[in-house]
Interface confidence: low
Amino acid sequence: KGEQISFRDCAEVFKSGHTTNGVYTLTLPNSTEEVKAYCDMEAGGGGWTIIQRREDGSVDFQRTWKEYKVGFGNPSGEYWLGNEFVSQLTNQQRYVLKIHLKDWEGNEAYSLYEHFYLSSEELNYRIHLKGLTGTAGKISSISQPGNDFSTKDADNDKCICKCSQMLTGGWWFDACGPSNLNGMYYPQRQNTNKFNGIKWYYWKGSGYSLKGTTMMIRPAG
């Protein structure tokens, strides 16, 4: 019986000859746990593992710590891959993070971090980022140094308030910080002056809620 081939990320899927965008099954080395992830095989050389996508407001992102841990949503549409998988993956080798953004006027922008990883659950999946380039702002809209992840039932931010409850969604909130890509999805013409929307401050400012976001990772180099 032939050995079952497993892929840890979309870069491995891409290298194996699968060059079509779509949902693939990923498995970490020395693990039987499988996750379904969307692989972007076209953008910037292909092999990107999508860890977050917002596009139409069809999925509720005001979820619990456990749901953000294991992931939720539809990998073909709006979803969160899962903090535990991403943490384990990004601690096995060096990954880059690309965040692709769309506004309601047809503009697109991106932020690329040359090194990205998440700490373990014991350290609240704290985000670590280095080396920002891109068109979505010269300053990182994810607060630096990185913060712990917070959800509606796990308040790990630096605010007097509870950012996840006020701004909605799980995120690496500061107090509350210049971004939240997991905020409320507001349709066009309802997307301005929204404090709890999908925010990337150093591109669109404080009250602008974005039309679409994609967070994707790929091994560095």
């Epitope: 007097i160 701004l167 925010k199 404080s206």
Partner: antibody
């Protein structure tokens, strides 16, 4: 200019209640938390809690839970602190103080729990039988 | 709950440097604010976010923070600096503000 003006001194009997007011002027009242801090004679500062004038939400120090009520009237930019079941050890100067609301000013929404940048002049409350 | 420890008093001659400490478990990871209070007056913010000064506060006032100790430093001390000084931090585990017990700064004549 920016200022907080508090109501005058009060003398109360044990078991009574006291309500101290704090009128804000010179800034956007809704954009700042209002804190209450007290100081017993010869003692240090003691934080009692805050109210978010924008939402009316409150956060009281454990020690005062059940005895303190913080309210506000946004139409006249005034915050209130009511302390009930007064005891002699509640004799103190009560201060209101503001701090920027880290949620309201979300441009870029990047505020640490902010310091108390403006204080009222204080209200002396004496509890004596 | 989180506890901040300050020395009750610090004495210094005019023109010298005064250092007032504020001890707390891993306080180095927190943002520390410092207030000056003169007799019969309300407190005044002199240093916020560990080392920043509000407008109108002289450069002689500075702050630092590392490990388990935050420090307010007043250089070239003047008679008018005589006051009580309080440190303050936000304790995110209890969602409460905490003040130190205060330090009386005496400027020797």
């Amino acid at each position: 200019q920016v200022q907080l003006v508090q109501s005058g001194a009060e003398v109360k009997k044990p078991g009574a209640s006291v309500k101290v007011s704090c009128k804000a002027s010179g800034y956007n009242f809704a954009g700042y938390y209002m804190h209450w801090v007290r100081q017993a004679p010869g003692q240090g500062l003691e934080w009692m809690g805050w109210i978010n004038p924008n939402s009316g939400g409150t956060n009281y120090a454990q020690k005062f839970q059940g005895r303190v009520t913080m309210t506000r009237d946004t139409s006249i930019s005034t915050a209130y602190m009511e302390l009930s079941r007064l005891r002699s050890d509640d004799t103190a100067v009560y201060y209101c103080a503001r701090s920027p609301n880290p949620y309201y000013y979300s441009s870029p929404g990047y505020y640490y729990p902010a310091a108390f940048d403006i204080w009222g002049q204080g209200t002396m409350v004496t509890v004596s039988s | 709950s989180y506890v901040l420890t300050q020395p009750p008093s610090v004495s210094v001659a005019p023109g010298q440097t005064a250092r007032i400490t504020c001890g707390g478990n891993n306080i180095g990871s927190k943002s520390v604010h410092w207030y000056q209070q003169k007799p019969g007056q309300a407190p005044v913010l002199v240093v916020y976010d560990t080392s920043d000064r509000p407008s109108g506060i002289p450069e002689r006032f500075s702050g630092s923070n590392s490990g388990n100790t935050a420090t307010l430093t007043i250089s070239r001390v003047e008679a008018g600096d005589e006051a009580d000084y309080y440190c303050q931090v936000w304790d995110s585990s209890s969602d409460h503000w905490v003040f130190g017990g205060g330090t009386k700064l005496t400027v020797l004549s």
